[in-house]
Interface confidence: low
């Protein structure tokens, strides 16, 4: 079954490589188990960047070597991305699923185009 | 624009073989699902088997379990559906049909043959070859 997704048309990285949005979703029915993953799409190809299962009203627990970190509020999960570089701009997309109780949703937010420009190197001070 | 066109049917004895293939146009298998279905006369669509082309998982129907193999060539953009040890209880209408990758669950195992065996999973259907079989 569909579910609406939103987030952030476009978003800039900081200088050091950290980009942070807000997925939410609309949740048709009371989810325990959601599970939140992040693509990203550039020159048609699409790759997981990094996902997460969590319970409600619990921490998102991602991998130990993951570029991700997120907290969830409600229906919002707050993500954040590290260690991005100018090659990493592309469309971020969120995705949602709320895995149990059934019956099983899935939610597909447009995509957040993350801009990372790589910082200029500081000159060499004598 | 997605276009998806099978080929392969036909009329064959009990206990023969075919292959069924899908040819896709308008994008890669790369990061889509492809199903086949099939719908005997007066009965419900049916999901046979599915590839997902993310991870090459397949997924079968038990009625055609250790019969059917499923399979892709992405260099031809085409994935097949090879049928052996057919029954008269495999006539039907045979449909290949595709989804987006992003549009896959986090399923696996018998979850996901639920999911992707579902017709309404499905966002882009071909047109469908007919497979006799009868003696």
């Known amino acids: 079954k569909a579910m609406h997704v939103a987030q952030p048309a476009v978003v800039l990285a900081s200088s050091r490589g950290i980009a942070s949005f807000v997925c939410e979703y609309a949740s048709p029915g009371k989810a325990t188990e959601v599970r939140v993953t992040v693509l990203r799409q550039a020159d048609s190809q699409v790759t997981e960047v990094c996902a997460a299962t969590y319970m409600m009203g619990n921490e998102l627990t991602f991998l130990d070597d993951s570029i991700c970190t997120g907290t969830s509020s409600g229906n919002q999960v707050n993500l954040t991305i590290q260690g991005l570089r100018a090659m990493d701009t592309g469309l971020y997309i969120c995705k949602v699923e709320l895995m149990y109780p059934p019956p099983y949703y899935l939610g597909i937010g447009n995509g957040t185009q993350i801009y990372v420009i790589d910082p200029e190197p500081c000159p060499d001070s004598d | 624009e997605v276009q998806l066109v099978e080929s392969g049917g036909g009329l064959v004895q009990p206990g023969g073989s075919l292959r069924l293939s899908c040819a896709a146009s308008?994008?890669?298998?790369?990061?889509?699902?492809i199903g086949w279905f099939r719908q005997a006369p007066g009965k419900e669509r049916e999901g046979v088997s599915c590839?997902?082309?993310?991870?090459?998982?397949?997924y079968y129907a038990d009625s055609v379990k250790g019969r059917f193999t499923i399979s892709r060539d992405n260099a031809k953009n085409t994935v097949y559906l090879q049928m052996n040890s057919l029954k008269p209880e495999d006539t039907a209408v045979y449909y290949c049909?595709?989804?987006?990758?992003?549009?896959?669950?986090?399923?696996?195992?018998?979850?996901?043959?639920?999911?992707?065996?579902?017709?309404?999973?499905?966002?882009?259907w071909g047109q469908g070859t007919q497979v006799t079989v009868s003696s």
């Open positions: 308008g994008f890669t298998l790369d990061y889509y699902a």
């Open positions: 590839i997902v082309g993310s991870d090459g998982s397949t």
């Open positions: 049909a595709a989804v987006h990758g992003l549009k896959l669950p986090t399923l696996r195992g018998l979850g996901g043959s639920y999911y992707y065996l579902q017709a309404r999973s499905y966002d882009y």
